[in-house]
């Protein structure tokens, strides 16, 4: 018979034949042959593989480093990685939760809608037209543009979401 060019789901092609992939939680020891099945071995303690695979090494479980404020939210198994979270009152810097911050700051152009608490991180909002923020802050709201008119001045430079307007003297009519 013709050697296969593609294999079924949960199989892989090697040496012109289809071998079974190793199930999650196991790694490949040896490929199948004409006469033998794929040989797989369970991952060791603190290791995992989360897909049907032909990996020869299992992945190490993530380490939740307490020096970075991390703790284990969910212990890893042979099929799943460890999930880290931050100590109470702290917040993950990313979805992967690789480090912790007390709270995040809102970038220039954004103001603080709600200051962080023990359970929720800072909530930022974009500065609307007429408001600006030129700093990174965990407490400052967007500030309204300066009103040049109330100072008997005119707008020399328009404001943006990151900068205030620049006011200047009114042009005097020449006689």
């Amino acid at each position: 018979p013709e050697p296969p060019t593609a294999c079924r789901e949960k199989q892989y092609l090697i040496n012109s034949q289809c071998c079974s992939l190793c199930q999650p939680g196991q790694k490949l020891v040896s490929d199948c042959t004409e006469f033998t099945e794929t040989e797989c071995l369970p991952c060791g303690e603190s290791e995992f593989l989360d897909t049907w695979n032909r990996e020869t090494h299992c992945h190490q479980h993530k380490y939740c480093d307490p020096n970075l404020g991390l703790r284990v939210q969910q212990k890893g198994t042979s099929e799943t990685d460890t999930i880290c979270t931050c100590e109470e009152g702290w917040h993950c810097t990313s979805e992967a939760c690789e480090s912790c911050v007390l709270h995040r700051s809102c970038s220039p152009g954004f103001g603080v809608k709600q200051i962080a608490t023990g359970v929720s991180d800072t909530i930022c909002e974009p500065c609307p037209v007429g408001f600006f923020s030129n700093v990174s802050s965990a407490f400052e709201k967007c500030h309204p543009w300066t009103s040049c008119e109330t100072k008997d001045l005119v707008v020399q430079q328009a404001g943006t979401n990151k900068t205030d307007v620049v006011c200047g003297p009114q042009d005097r009519l020449r006689a």
Partner: nanobody
């Protein structure tokens, strides 16, 4: 790497005053937003007060408004918290924090006990 060292805590009677200091080493605090945060025994972290990098804007939690004053002296690389009219519920370990507020910047804190 910045290190923050809080000091000035102690035992004080209700109605008394204390001034906390936070001295930074290894990095300047100039231009950086700074916070005072506290943790009462068996409670979570509470954000008490903050000051902008310029010193022009401040924030106070409702629980300390009118009693606490935050200030900074960038030439001394130090943040302060003046605490007046202290109450039993102000008893906590007080920490200072510097933008970007990483856990590994966290100091040891200074314990404030308000008791008669």
């Amino acid at each position: 790497e910045v290190q923050l060292l809080e000091s000035g805590g102690g035992l004080v009677q209700p109605g008394g005053s204390l001034r906390l200091s936070c001295a930074a080493s290894g990095s300047t605090i100039a231009g950086y937003e700074m916070w005072w945060v506290r943790q009462a025994p068996g409670k979570g972290l509470e954000r008490v007060s903050a000051i902008s990098g310029s010193g022009g804007s401040t924030y106070y939690a409702d629980s300390v408004k009118g009693r606490f004053t935050i200030s900074r002296d960038d030439s001394k690389n130090t943040l302060y918290l003046q605490m007046n009219s202290l109450r039993a519920e102000d008893t906590a370990v007080y920490y200072c924090a510097k933008d970007p507020y990483s856990f590994d910047y966290w100091g040891q804190g200074t314990l404030v006990t308000v008791s008669s």
